[in-house]
Amino acid sequence: SWMWNQFFLLEEYTGSDYQYVGKLHSDQDRGDGSLKYILSGDGAGDLFIINENTGDIQATKRLDREEKPVYILRAQAINRRTGRPVEPESEFIIKIHDINDNEPIFTKEVYTATVPEMSDVGTFVVQVTATDADDPTYGNSAKVVYSILQGQPYFSVESETGIIKTALLNMDRENREQYQVVIQAKDMGGQMGGLSGTTTVNITLTDVNDNPPRFPQSTYQFKTPESSPPGTPIGRIKASDADVGENAEIEYSITDGEGLDMFDVITDQETQEGIITVKKLLDFEKKKVYTLKVEASNPYVEPRFLYLGPFKDSATVRIVVEDVDEPPVFSKLAYILQIREDAQINTTIGSVTAQDPDAARNPVKYSVDRHTDMDRIFNIDSGNGSIFTSKLLDRETLLWHNITVIATEINNPKQSSRVPLYIKVLDVNDNAPTGLSTGA
């Protein structure tokens, strides 16, 4: 029968001679050279050669366990004289013995990961994994230990699992957003002489709402003409928020001030500005200055950061109303006057009054629109608005006179107003009857 143990061969042999594997031997071998040993199978005749007389096997090349850990060969012992096998053909194994010739290799050259800013210490970030091609079943050649080469004191790595965690409290994205962490994986359980590999982990802190909006100035002033219709934008204010995305969204509101019902603030979603608009008609003559308190607040607040203070800020907005010169206003929309048809020239019929509505109360002068009184039957006192006749009247010619009176500001002739006057001529019995027959 065959006599051998399992053959073991150290990988990566660096000697100058062929590497001795072992000896095939049959108990039929009397040592007289009558037996011939033949090798077949994995690498026979190429990687492995056999001394056909002695049965000694040698390896002709450096072997790499990580390429092929086991070689299966077959052995034959033949009687040289008869050419017949003296043993049944038998399979045997050459097992390649591991040495620590492979460093750990990470599954990725570069990892990217994110973790929320302000996370608690020990918050999971990412897990890195390195594999070692050496034999995990023998020695520590494939026993990998992780350590952090760069990235302290911000991050730590669990030595056995490769799990990266936050290691520092209150890491603030607004202060620093990007971190580059270098992780080492070392075999031999991390002991001296172990082989190592490294990977880079790019960690980005993601935003949380830990910053309130802040107005860059405490006071704003805008001016607007009193003629601005409701909806008119009169100014923009902008609070800044160091956060990003929805955490930086701002809503504006008017919280206090005399202009609470006179103005609105709307949020421009594009620019995150507050637009102050006119809500009700303004009147310089009633109020010239409004002071508002405008608040900027985050609509999305994280309760755990409320201890940092209120997530809002306020500013004072002073709105100054500009005077717009307005034309005089008559005391009535129309005047109806009466006069007897027998009235003498210069008879006063009545009067009109108009007043400058502006605070300055500019004096007003009156005149008759001559297009409406071509015959110049009526006149007006330019100072007090008294209407009087300048010609004799005849009811039988015209029963009603419709004229227009103009009021003009003396200091500003561009500002004028018009009002209709309806003058009724009253009948006086001044005509004898005509066309009547008198019967006897």
């Epitope: 860059p216 100035q217 405490s218 006071t219 704003y220 002033q221 001016k223 310089f284 003559e285 109020k287 010239k288 200055v289 004072t316 002073r318 100054v320 109303v321 500009e322 005077d323 717009v324 502006d358 605070a359 300055a360 109360r361 200091n411």
Partner: antibody, heavy 122, light 106 residues
């Protein structure tokens, strides 16, 4: 030309009131804001309030709210500033100053009165 | 409220000197700034408005510059009648004055 002429110096006891006048000429009195500014001895200038003589509307510095009253008499083109509950720290020169704009309550002061010294002393 | 800080508080100079006075606002006031000159026993006199516009009748040796929060008044060649106290004033929102700069004869 525009002129603002103020009333003469006053000496008052603590707790009393003082009324300083400012007569305007050379422009339409009702069309410009009239401001009052004070200056304590060796100190800077401090804005107190304004009046729009056209309709009598006023605005006061919060610091003086409740103690200061500014009025105007359109018939004589005169503005008045009355300060009540006087204390020693109210000792100052009080100036009237014309606001540059007629149409809105803003802007700088283009003409000033000569000032009225008010001394508060017991 | 907006605060105005003027510097220096006083300076000594000779006739013909170039003098620069600065004024700093506690927040952006754009160009809403005026400079006044005040002589002893008189009311202030407007020199410059809107930060850099010379008031009518004021000599051209006076000039103003700046916007936002930092402003300067420059007297290019000091004259005997220029020895006085100078004030800056913001009128962006309400009214506030600097504490003044006294220009004295060296």
């Amino acid at each position: 030309e525009v002129q603002l002429v103020q009333s003469g110096a006053e000496v008052k006891k603590p707790g009393a009131s003082v009324k300083v006048s400012c007569k305007a000429s050379g422009y339409t009195f009702t069309r410009n804001f009239m401001h009052w500014v004070r200056q304590a001895p060796g100190q800077g200038l401090e804005w107190m309030g304004w009046i729009y003589p056209g309709d009598g509307e006023t605005e006061y510095n919060q610091k003086f709210q409740g103690r200061v009253t500014i009025t105007a008499d359109r018939s004589t083109s005169t503005a008045y500033m009355e300060l009540s509950s006087l204390r020693s720290e109210d000792t100052a020169v009080y100036f009237c100053a014309r606001g540059v704009y007629g149409g809105f309550a803003g802007g700088y002061f283009d003409f000033w009165g000569q000032g009225t010294l008010v001394t508060v002393s017991s | 409220d907006i605060q105005m800080t003027q510097s220096p508080s006083s300076l000594s100079a000779s006739v013909g000197d170039r003098v620069t006075i600065t004024c700093k606002a506690s927040q952006n006031i754009y160009k809403n700034l005026a400079w006044y000159q005040q002589k002893l026993g008189e009311g202030p006199k407007l020199l410059i408005y809107d930060a850099n516009t010379l008031q009518t009748g004021v000599p051209s040796r006076f000039s103003g510059s700046g916007s936002g929060t930092d402003f300067t008044l420059t007297i290019s060649s000091l004259q005997p009648e220029d020895f006085a106290t100078y004030y800056c004033q913001q009128y962006y929102s309400g009214w506030a004055f600097g504490q003044g700069t006294k220009v004295e004869i060296k």
